[in-house]
């Protein structure tokens, strides 16, 4: 059967993003419509046809355009994605003979981790704090020279869609840690980044 090939995309917040649909058919469509999937009913964004060219709905005027003007291959581009743009989008190819053939491409917005790593001595113990804020939620791990060191983790979701993960390493005998390196590892979207801290007695 005739089908539409799409690919999901993941792009960084406040950067451009493109979604593409390809009609696997001998014939071009008569008109292509892009819609955003919503809970109740899809919202029309933009259409392209030979008769009328590109017609962008007012709500999307300064947000998107069709950057591949095809009736078999169609690409929409968001100039500067925000968290509100995350979601799934439908491309509908209205074809002669076979009606509306649709595909769905989903856009995921990510925010690169912002990491802070610091330590604090207090009386007989040392606390090393590693905090990572990102979207989707990052994971925080520790690499320390010896085992048996306790840590506690707190997760906080922010209204802007990012999540902060804060992990505190509790070291009971801080003298043994002076001059040694502690590594906070942040895992985000499959990539692990090391953040190193050498403890100095202040």
């Amino acid at each position: 059967q005739v089908q539409v090939v799409t690919q999901d995309e993941r792009e960084q917040l406040y950067t451009p993003a493109s979604l593409k649909c390809s009609l696997q058919n001998a014939q071009e469509a008569l008109i292509v419509t892009w819609q955003k999937k919503k809970a109740v009913s899809p919202e029309n964004m933009v259409t392209f046809s030979e008769n009328h060219g590109v017609v962008i709905q007012p709500a999307y005027k300064d947000k998107i355009n069709i950057t591949q003007l095809g009736l078999q291959n169609s690409t929409i581009t968001f100039w500067n994605i925000t968290l509100e743009d995350e979601g799934c989008y439908m491309c509908l190819f209205n074809t002669f003979g076979f009606g509306k053939i649709s595909g769905t491409a989903c856009l995921t917005v990510y925010v690169q981790p912002i990491v802070s790593l610091h330590y604090k001595f207090s009386e007989d113990h040392l606390n090393i704090t590693c905090s990572a804020t990102a979207r989707p939620a990052p994971m925080v791990f520790w690499k320390v020279p010896r085992s048996g060191i306790e840590n506690s983790t707190v997760t906080l979701s922010h209204p802007n869609g990012t999540t902060s993960v804060t992990s505190i390493l509790h070291i009971k005998d801080p003298k043994n840690q002076v001059g040694k390196e502690v590594i906070c590892q942040v895992l985000h979207l499959g990539t692990v980044t090391d953040f190193k801290q050498t403890v100095n007695k202040g």
């Epitope: 005739v2 008769n51 002669f96």
Partner: antibody, heavy 117, light 107 residues
């Protein structure tokens, strides 16, 4: 040059089936939809269905309640329209045509199918 | 199914006349309408597609207009070879349906 050549006239008894062929030449067969329309004596044209030879996807007029089947043989550049459970009202001239999207340009010469007991 | 109604069903005209045939759809069909000419014993011939686009090789005296539910085929100056039956076809929604035809005769 582009040609659509249909099979010859047929006389069938009620309840029988008929299979009409439409042989295409002069162009790439899979690039155009093949459509079938018919015209009973003194009646308007009637769209029966069509096939996209590229995939073999077809679409039928539900009026024919599953009696019509459109197929294609890409190696022979030929489309077929089979109509089963024939009745006298199916007596008509059957035409195949080709279209690129909604642009119809070439037609077969027509095949007269007579259903009579 | 979408019903297509042509008017008039038949009309008599003379060579050189300007002739208008109308086609009305029972619901909005956008611009998805074609016009065909058919002569006795012959296959239909496409004249206009997408309401107003002329098929290659069709004389410019033929023109189409309209969108939504009301459509018109105009022949600006009738020629002897134009006497035939004319059909409209909607292809907005399946099954695609033809009008009943307009027979154009010599007066």
């Amino acid at each position: 040059q582009v040609q659509l050549v249909q099979s010859g006239a047929e006389v069938k008894k009620p309840g029988a089936s008929v299979k009409v062929s439409c042989k295409a030449s002069g162009y790439s067969f899979t690039d155009y939809i093949i459509l079938w329309v018919r015209q009973a004596p003194g009646q308007r044209l009637e769209w029966m269905g069509h096939i996209d030879p590229y995939y073999g996807s077809s679409n039928y007029n539900l009026k024919f309640k599953g009696r019509v089947t459109i197929t294609r043989d890409t190696s022979a550049s030929t489309a077929y329209m089979e109509l089963s459970s024939l009745r006298s009202e199916d007596t008509a001239v059957y035409y195949c045509g080709r279209s690129k999207r909604d642009y119809f340009d070439y037609w077969g010469q027509g095949t007269l199918v007579t259903v009579s007991s | 199914d979408i019903q297509m109604t042509q008017s008039p069903s038949s009309l008599s005209a003379s060579v050189g006349d300007r002739v208008t045939i109308t086609c009305k759809a029972s619901q909005d069909i956008n611009s998805y309408l074609s016009w065909f000419q058919q002569k006795p014993g012959k296959a239909p011939k496409s004249l206009i597609y997408r309401a107003n686009r002329l098929v290659d090789g069709v004389p410019s005296r033929f023109s189409g207009s309209g969108s939504g539910t009301d459509f018109t085929l105009t022949i600006s100056s009738l020629q002897p070879e134009d006497f035939a039956i004319y059909y409209c076809l909607q292809y907005d929604e399946f099954p695609y349906t033809f009008g009943q035809g307009t027979k154009l005769e010599i007066k």
